[in-house]
């Protein structure tokens, strides 16, 4: 078995880091491989083991439980196949952040001619990401996802108002949201579960 390239690792910056790696042939990840990891520069850190699972026939993924990270945390990692080391490297959770995807995306009808989208930030108020995330909302036609609008939410509150008539009347639309950290290096979260609604409004007489 050979590892193709470097494993890709991300932290959710609260409890879990995830590493994924590609192999040159099909493997049973949980029986053939294991990932050892240990907090570096800390005298009493224990050696921990993650048993990977298959995300595809030649792809393994490991979800590692970690303490809430601090900026200086760095983990030594070693990937083993029985008694043979396939890879070793290090990983800094605060330097590779992929936040938890938002949830509970909800559409509210507003008193004016606007829709209000709200969602939940899954981070507690004592976590850095509680006040560091920016959001991206994608709204697309259900029957043609290539026709979409993107809103960048550049404030702390997990909400977005937009005019009903910016979208076509009599059409089903789908919305989803994702987030990313600003002050930490990393990537966008996965998209939230999407919601779908029927966009209907009365056209002005002149447009009917």
């Amino acid at each position: 078995i050979k590892v193709l390239g470097e494993p890709t690792c991300f932290s959710d910056y609260i409890r879990t880091s995830t590493c994924e790696w590609f192999l040159d042939s099909a493997v049973d990840c949980s029986s053939q491989l294991c990932l050892h990891y240990r907090l570096m520069f800390f005298e009493f850190s224990e050696n921990l083991t993650c048993i990977p699972r298959n995300s595809a026939s030649t792809v393994c993924v490991c979800h590692m439980e970690m303490n809430r990270p601090v900026q200086s945390d760095r983990y030594q990692m070693e990937l083993w196949a029985e008694h043979r080391q396939l890879w070793q490297g290090s990983f800094s959770p605060s330097g590779n952040v992929k936040p938890l995807a938002p949830d509970n995306l909800t559409l509210h009808t507003n008193v004016s001619d606007e829709w209000l989208l709200t969602w939940n930030n899954l981070y507690p108020s004592n976590n850095l990401l509680y006040k560091d995330l920016i959001s991206m909302v994608n709204i697309s036609r259900e029957d043609n996802p290539a026709e979409f609008i993107v809103y960048n939410v550049t404030y702390k509150e997990p909400r977005l108002s937009f005019p009903i008539n910016i979208l076509m009347s009599g059409v089903y639309y789908t919305a989803r949201v994702r987030v990313r950290s600003q002050i930490l290096t990393g990537t966008w979260s996965e998209w939230s579960p999407s919601i779908t609604w029927y966009n209907h409004f009365q056209l002005p007489l002149i447009q009917r």
């Epitope: 601090v70 900026q71 605060s94 850095l128 006040k131 560091d132 550049t154 702390k156």
Partner: antibody, heavy 120, light 106 residues
């Protein structure tokens, strides 16, 4: 009205230390990242450091890593910059700046600055 | 790693349009901020997010970006616009400033 008032500047010998403070008012201090920016005499603006809203994450310009430490006390609405092993090249006006919530938007408010002179 | 490059000086006649460029950033990926600084004063933000103006900034100030260049445009420059102007970007672990441009209004 947002106000940022720097203090703690002065004359210090090379190799010495100084601690700058920035008292903030007029906004919810612990909602925002904060930064220090400096300007040497007759020169342009130079970014020094940034600190996250809760003090957990800090970043520094390369030339200041290991010598400067940014910190904050959210209970006192105050930002700090501890400067050690000062060199003549650190002589500058030091500004405290409030970040927009969106960091890519830069600074919406600046203090008036405090002069730091490193000279024997 | 990249550097932001600005012309050291730009001149404009009173009432004419001044353009100050900032080169070297990937402005498809980075937003530019622009600051005005008058002698002996703290900087003031005149543009954020490449093209947005803070409240209180005259409408003659506008910003745009394309490719590796961000541009600050002052349409109908006034005598009080004479100042130093700096561009700035955030790149996920810190800020970078351009070297600054001195605008002279003739």
């Amino acid at each position: 009205e947002v106000q940022l008032v720097e203090s703690g500047g002065g004359l210090v010998q090379p190799g010495g230390s100084l601690r700058l403070s920035c008292a903030a008012s007029g906004f919810t201090f612990d909602d925002y990242a904060m930064s220090w920016v400096r300007q040497a005499p007759g020169k342009g603006l130079e970014w020094v450091s940034i600190i996250s809203w809760n003090g957990e994450i800090t970043h520094y310009a390369e030339s200041m890593k290991g010598r400067f430490t940014i910190s904050r006390d959210n209970a006192k609405n105050t930002l700090y910059l501890q400067m050690n092993t000062l060199k003549s090249g650190d002589t500058a006006v030091y500004y405290c700046a409030k970040n927009h919530y969106t960091l890519t938007w830069g600074y919406d408010y600046w203090g008036q600055g405090t002069q730091v002179t490193v000279s024997s | 790693n990249f550097m932001l490059t600005q012309p050291s000086a730009v001149s404009v006649s009173l009432g004419q349009t001044a353009r100050i460029t900032c080169q070297g950033g990937n402005f498809g990926r980075y937003y530019a901020s622009w600051y005005q600084q008058k002698p002996g004063q703290a900087p003031v933000q005149v543009i954020y997010g490449s093209s947005n103006s803070p409240s209180g900034i005259p409408e003659r100030f506008s910003g745009s970006s394309s490719g590796d260049t961000a541009t600050l445009t002052i349409s109908g420059a006034q005598a009080e616009d004479e100042a130093d102007y700096y561009c700035q970007v955030w790149d996920s672990s810190g800020y970078k400033f351009g070297g600054g441009t001195t605008l002279t209004v003739l």
